[in-house]
């Protein structure tokens, strides 16, 4: 069984290559009873969803940039 069907995780797998310019927003879900792992879910500018690898340095930079832009708005 996949992680998503074993727990209530939303990310079955993570997208490896994604350009920050294609991302509209990012939601970081902390681990909880529903899912034991941190999940990074990006909403793309085309309206689709993608799960990103929270351990990836590029993803960390994307999250940091998004959070900073939220604070400045």
């Amino acid at each position: 069984a996949s992680v998503a069907t074993e727990l209530r995780c939303q990310c079955l797998q993570t997208l490896q290559g994604i350009h920050p310019k294609n991302i509209q927003s990012v939601n970081v879900k902390s681990p909880g009873p529903h899912c034991a792992q941190t999940e990074v879910i990006a909403t793309l500018k085309n309206g689709r969803k993608a799960c990103l690898n929270p351990a990836s340095p590029i993803v960390k930079k994307i999250i940091e940039k998004m959070l900073n832009s939220d604070k400045s708005n």
């Epitope: 069984a1 074993e6 209530r8 995780c9 939303q10 990310c11 079955l12 993570t14 879900k29 993608a50």
Partner: antibody, heavy 125, light 107 residues
Framework: EVQLLESGGGLVQPGGSLRLSCAAS????????MSWVRQAPGKGLEWVSA????????YYASSVKGRFTISRDNSKNTLYLQMNSLRAEDTAVYYC??????????????????WGQGTPVTVSS | DIQMTQSPSSLSASVGDRVTITCRAS??????LHWYQQKPGKAPKLLIY???NLESGVPSRFSGSGSGTDFTLTISSLQPEDFATYYC?????????FGQGTKLEIK
Amino acid sequence: EVQLLESGGGLVQPGGSLRLSCAASGFTFSELSMSWVRQAPGKGLEWVSAISGSGGSTYYASSVKGRFTISRDNSKNTLYLQMNSLRAEDTAVYYCAREGGRLEPYYYYYAMDVWGQGTPVTVSS
Amino acid sequence: DIQMTQSPSSLSASVGDRVTITCRASQSISDNLHWYQQKPGKAPKLLIYDASNLESGVPSRFSGSGSGTDFTLTISSLQPEDFATYYCQQYYSTPLTFGQGTKLEIK
């Protein structure tokens, strides 16, 4: 045709037990999480419990934790709800629901996209 | 637990009206919210998933929007078959929780 059919409801005395069943057909049962949702007479929807596709993970509302047990038999395509120490406030129509929702290969949402017809449970002396 | 609050609790409208129902979460739930329709004596039916996506077979007069804590369900032009009770539901975390429902009645 995707279908869920509940059974096992009825009248039971306070403190009694009941086991509800939900027979699934028309989809790969073992791949999807399932939930039980109830509705007391004239009231809104209340989520009761959920179980992962393999049955390895279970979740409960605080109002039923320790009294109700959710389980599934994937070989029989059947979901169960064992209800013990029943109280008057457990009186409701009980629905089983499939939690579908795979979007692309990277993202999964949990929406109750298929529901059974409901089975009534009355707890009364 | 995440509390979901719907408003109004009941609403009277006429065929052809545009109707908006709101749902507020007690904490941010991103867009992890669904809308259901229920008619008397029937099981609920999924209308909108993930705040804004129309479930297959649902008429396009239904639409959803919102993210974070505030969400809306809009029916652009009420039809006779739309008179029912509507519920929002979050799945951001367990326990899953529903709003108390909005009963849409004929004026």
